[in-house]
């Protein structure tokens, strides 16, 4: 029997220092560009090689960004979210939600599961 797929959701505060080429990532989402059904949140779609985010190592593709410098990203148009990042200054604090896929074993198995993704 196949196990079901569950998700372990954690939150983290990530402080980035803007590098010579910026923060070094792309985003999708917003009220006018829903990336996840019924969720207008902002998601990291690309971490650029050798950019500030990649060098820091904590931000991951697929993470949901909840706030920038304490400002909530809920219910923002996509371009407004983009502008918020671009105007966020030199030191940028991100509150992010990581979603780790966990493959559970068959029913009755009480192991921790096999993280993947």
């Amino acid at each position: 029997m196949n196990g079901r797929v569950d998700y372990l959701v954690t939150e983290e505060e990530i402080n980035l220092t803007r590098g010579p080429s910026g923060l070094g990532f792309n985003i999708v989402g917003g009220t006018d560009q829903q990336y996840v059904s019924n969720d207008s949140g902002i998601y990291v779609s690309r971490i650029k090689e050798n950019g500030a985010a990649a060098l820091d190592g904590r931000l991951q593709e697929g993470d949901k960004i909840l706030s920038v410098n304490g400002q909530d990203l809920k219910n923002l148009l996509h371009q407004d979210a983009v502008d918020l990042f671009r105007n966020a200054g030199y030191a940028v604090s991100l509150r992010v939600q990581h979603r780790l896929q966990v493959q559970n074993g068959p029913i009755g198995h009480r192991g921790e599961g096999d993280p993947s993704g």
Epitope: G24, F25, E61, F85
Partner: nanobody
Framework: DVQLVESGGGLVQAGGSLRLSCAAS????????MGWFRQRPGKERDVVAT????????YYLDSVKGRFTISRDNAKNTVFLQMNSLKPEDTAVYYC??????????????????????WGQGTQVTVS
């Protein structure tokens, strides 16, 4: 990480057609910009065609315009390259490539160019 597997290559006569497919796995396909590149014998790897994550923007190498068509099927996690009116100079190893799409948080002018983060192993196309 993203895994890419190309298929559909082969030997075809000049004037013929082939349809290349690239199946992606490892993360949501709908957020990926996709591209097809080729490496001809003794040459650098060149971009052939690209399609952005929303499917509303495409690019074609001048020499394939009107002959090749890139498309994507998000339901099947697959990108296609329909190649018609093939010429001997189209002979090459064709590679599928992917990167995260969306908007750069750094600059409106940073559209990524032809820099891709994930690559397939390639499929040989030979036009005789």
């Amino acid at each position: 990480d993203v895994q890419l597997v190309e298929s559909g290559g082969g030997l075809v006569q000049a004037g013929g057609s082939l349809r290349l497919s690239c199946a992606a796995s490892g993360r949501p396909f709908s957020s990926l910009d996709m591209g097809w590149f080729r490496q001809r014998p003794g040459k650098e790897r060149d971009v052939v065609a690209t399609i952005n994550w929303t499917g509303d923007s495409t690019y074609y190498l001048d020499s394939v315009k009107g002959r090749f068509t890139i498309s994507r099927d998000n339901a099947k996690n697959t990108v296609f390259l329909q190649m018609n009116s093939l010429k001997p100079e189209d002979t090459a190893v064709y590679y599928c490539a992917a990167r995260g799409g969306g908007s750069s948080v750094d600059s409106e002018y940073d559209v990524g160019g032809f820099e891709y983060d994930y690559w397939g192993q390639g499929t040989q196309v030979t036009v005789s």
